[in-house]
Interface confidence: low
């Protein structure tokens, strides 16, 4: 009831709690002398379902049959309406619509750890929408019985608060859960189990790792477990990996040797436990242990490349470059690189340790046969040295790769293609594709990049250290024994018109023609590989179209003659530069008047 109902009553038949789909009869009746003053025939009783009128009747009582009520609670209110007054609330009733409980399914019980307590879970089935009581019963040997109840509408878990002990690990226990509400009851199938079936060990703790003689090949993992544990499973992975290595061990007694760890790698280790070979469940995984394995001496060999530069008639500069070993090859922190330079005929050798760099430059005589060896060292030893005979990499013209091209391939990639050299292509042992940012000054400090390609390949995709709007000088070397041939090309991954034109710095007269000199456009304003320069000129104060001369771009060229100017005429000259994407804006303007005689 929702109030004291002084004026009348609302009765519900057959019950306030009904099965979904049932019909209910609702009666509203006034108590004596509670109708409208004077005119009892004018009593108008109105039945509301929540706030909506569903029926009315003149008189002392109202009957209404209601069907199709939804699951859950529906509120009915009866009101009296008299002439010239507001409706008065008489009485009300709540009707609860639900279903009988379904049979609880998948009853399972567990005891966490040997000292834990037994707790069971089950699936309730569909919601009854009614107050439902669950009773969990556990019966064991010697007619022992435990019972626990919960009256929560969403109950699907109960803890008995009792501890099963391993005195008789094979003794049977039976659990059953019963659900009861106003519309019916249902019990689960019984679940029968032993101590070994339901005890789930606590996860191992106090995990440690030891490396005998600081060697990764002699590694033992230690941990502590509950007393009855028979089985363990270990999982471990490098910290930067998502995939676990898994090992199952029996009767490990808190220790296991690991044989396949990689050196100088941070690993994550976890352990889980179980009491019986085929009964019971695995514990949760332990907390992670993180540990770094010791170093081992490097494996693999460095990828070494070099550049020669002529200094004068007797000396040459050798620049050596090498790539870092991969983590799996370095097997530790590389402390230094050892470079040995040797003159092969005279036997003179020079060794140097390089720290913090992957390049080395030295000056050697142009005479003699020179070789270098480079190795990487960590705290445990050195890699095998990479040996290279220094030769003129571009000397063999017949070994030069043909038709070298460089084309943009997506973002910050350049596809380099070539044709094998004219000389017997089968003589090629490997190709090396080398690239570096193009700097007009031929700056030797510009980083060098390279990759090696098998002799049957005629293309390579270069992506390392490739930036948009930068021009790269690309060389393809074909190597055969102690000979090499090379071809070069300029290429960029992305280009647009240069941001500025060349700056004319001087115009000089030479035998009736002029020589224009200019400063290179700064690299960051070239916006790719320059293809051409244009020199424009027109008579000062003239409205005529300018004339122009277009010259192919050469890295080292910074001047050009023009011989079509008339003497004693003042001209205005300026320059632009072009990439494949278009022409730059004008550079500075210079005026010039040719003093010489007319042709």
């Amino acid at each position: 009831k929702i109030d004291a109902c002084k004026r009348g009553d609302v009765t519900v038949k057959p019950s306030h709690v009904i099965l979904l789909g049932s019909t209910v009869n609702i009666t509203c009746s006034l108590k004596p002398r509670q109708g409208c003053f004077h005119y009892s025939r004018r009593n108008k009783l109105i039945l509301y379902k929540f706030d909506r009128r569903i029926n009315f009747h003149h008189g002392h009582s109202l009957n209404s049959q209601v069907t199709g009520l939804p699951l859950g609670t529906t509120l009915f209110v009866c009101k009296l309406a008299c002439i010239n007054s507001d409706e008065i609330q008489i009485c009300g009733a709540e009707i609860f619509v639900g279903v009988a409980p379904e049979q609880p399914q998948n009853l399972s019980c567990i005891q966490k750890g040997e000292q834990g307590t037994v707790a069971c879970t089950w699936e309730r089935g569909r919601d009854t929408h009614l107050y439902t009581e669950y009773t969990l019963q556990l019966s064991g040997p010697k007619n022992l019985t435990w019972q626990k109840q919960c009256k929560d509408i969403y109950c699907d878990y109960l803890d008995f608060g009792i501890n099963l002990t391993p005195e008789s690990p094979e003794s049977n226990f039976t659990a059953k859960v019963t659900a009861v509400n106003s519309l019916g009851s249902s019990s689960s199938l019984p679940s029968t189990f032993t101590f070994l079936d339901i005890v789930r060990p606590l996860p191992p703790w106090d995990i440690r790792i030891k490396f005998q003689k600081a060697s990764v090949s002699r590694c033992t993992l230690y941990w502590r477990d509950e007393g009855l544990v028979l089985l363990n499973r270990l999982r471990y992975r490098p910290s930067n990996s998502r995939l676990w290595n898994m090992v199952n061990v029996t009767k490990a007694k808190g220790r296991h040797d690991l044989l396949d760890l990689k050196p100088f790698t941070e690993y994550e280790f976890q352990i889980s436990s179980k009491l019986h070979l085929y009964k019971g469940s695995w514990s949760d995984w332990s907390e992670s242990l993180r540990a770094q394995t010791p170093e081992e001496e490097p494996t693999g060999m460095l990828d070494v490349w070099y550049m020669k530069r002529h200094i004068d008639y007797s000396r040459q500069q050798i620049s050596l470059f090498w790539k870092n070993l991969s983590v799996s090859e370095a097997r530790g922190k590389i402390l230094h690189y050892q470079v040995t330079l040797q003159e092969l005929t005279g036997g003179k050798a020079m060794t140097q340790n390089i720290t913090g760099h992957t390049s080395w430059t030295t000056v050697i005589p142009r005479t003699g046969n020179w070789a270098v060896a480079v190795s990487a060292a960590n705290s445990k030893g050195s890699s095998l040295p990479t040996r290279i005979n220094i030769m003129n990499l571009c000397e063999a013209g017949l070994l030069a790769p043909r038709q070298v091209s460089a084309n943009s391939e997506g973002m910050d990639n350049i596809l380099v293609t070539w044709q094998p050299p004219r000389k017997d292509p089968s003589a090629v042992q490997e190709y090396v594709v080398e690239w570096r940012e193009l700097h007009p000054g031929g700056d030797t400090q510009v980083p060098l990049n390279w990759l090696r390609s098998r002799p049957y390949n005629v293309s390579a995709l270069i992506s390392e250290n490739i930036k948009s709007y930068i021009c790269y000088e690309i060389r393809v070397y074909a190597l055969s024994g102690d000979q090499g041939g090379c071809s070069s090309i300029l290429g960029n991954s992305k280009h647009k018109a240069p941001l500025s034109g060349p700056h004319i710095n001087a115009i000089t007269e030479e035998k009736g023609s002029i020589l224009i000199s200019w400063n290179s456009i700064p690299v960051q304003e070239q916006m790719g590989c320059l293809l051409h320069y244009r020199i424009y000129w027109k008579e000062r104060d003239s409205n005529s179209q300018p004339q122009l001369c277009e010259i192919p771009y050469r890295v080292s060229q910074n001047s050009h003659p023009i011989n079509s100017l008339q003497p004693r005429v003042t001209y205005v000259l300026w320059m632009t530069a072009l990439t494949a994407a278009g022409e730059s804006s004008h550079g500075n303007e210079r005026e010039f008047c040719l003093q010489g005689k007319a042709n």
Epitope: L531, H532, R534, Y536, Q545, P546, Q547, L548, C549, E550, I551, P552, I562, S564, L578, T579, A580, A581, G582, E583
Partner: nanobody, 127 residues
Framework: QVQLQESGGGLVQAGGSLRLSCAAS????????MGWFRQTPGKEREFVAA???????YYADSVKGRFTISRDNVKNTMYLQMDSLKPEDTAVYYC?????????????????????WGQGTQVTVSS
């Protein structure tokens, strides 16, 4: 000098497409300026499109947005893709080439800009 040979002309209906080719021999033309001109009987030769060695392209106003000039420097060939053809595009089409380094007016329709010419190929657009 460079020898030039046009091909790809023919009869096509208005709204159709043709692709003209100009094959160069004698030397590589990757740094040359190359152009297309056309001529109808009794009229002067008319500039159509040009491709300079630096990669710049230029078009006559009458063909902008319909014609595309391109070149394949490996094959030493220049192309003119002609789409949405109109009856007034009917003409003999000539291919021309000239060294990019030259002294002369900047406007590309100046015929003196080019010193090598092909024999021409007939394009007829019927309505």
């Amino acid at each position: 000098q460079v020898q030039l040979q046009e091909s790809g002309g023919g009869l096509v209906q208005a709204g159709g497409s043709l692709r003209l080719s100009c094959a160069a021999s004698g030397r590589t033309v990757d740094s040359y300026a190359m152009g297309w001109f056309r001529q109808t009987p009794g009229k002067e030769r008319e500039f159509v499109a040009a491709s300079w060695g630096g990669g710049s392209t230029y078009y006559a106003d009458s063909v902008k947005g319909r014609f595309t000039i391109s070149r394949d420097n490996v094959k030493n060939t220049m192309y003119l893709q002609m789409d949405s053809l109109k009856p007034e595009d009917t003409a003999v089409y000539y291919c021309a080439a000239g060294p990019t380094y030259y002294s002369g007016p900047i406007n590309d329709n100046w015929e003196g800009r080019y010193d090598s010419w092909g024999q021409g190929t007939q394009v007829t657009v019927s309505s």
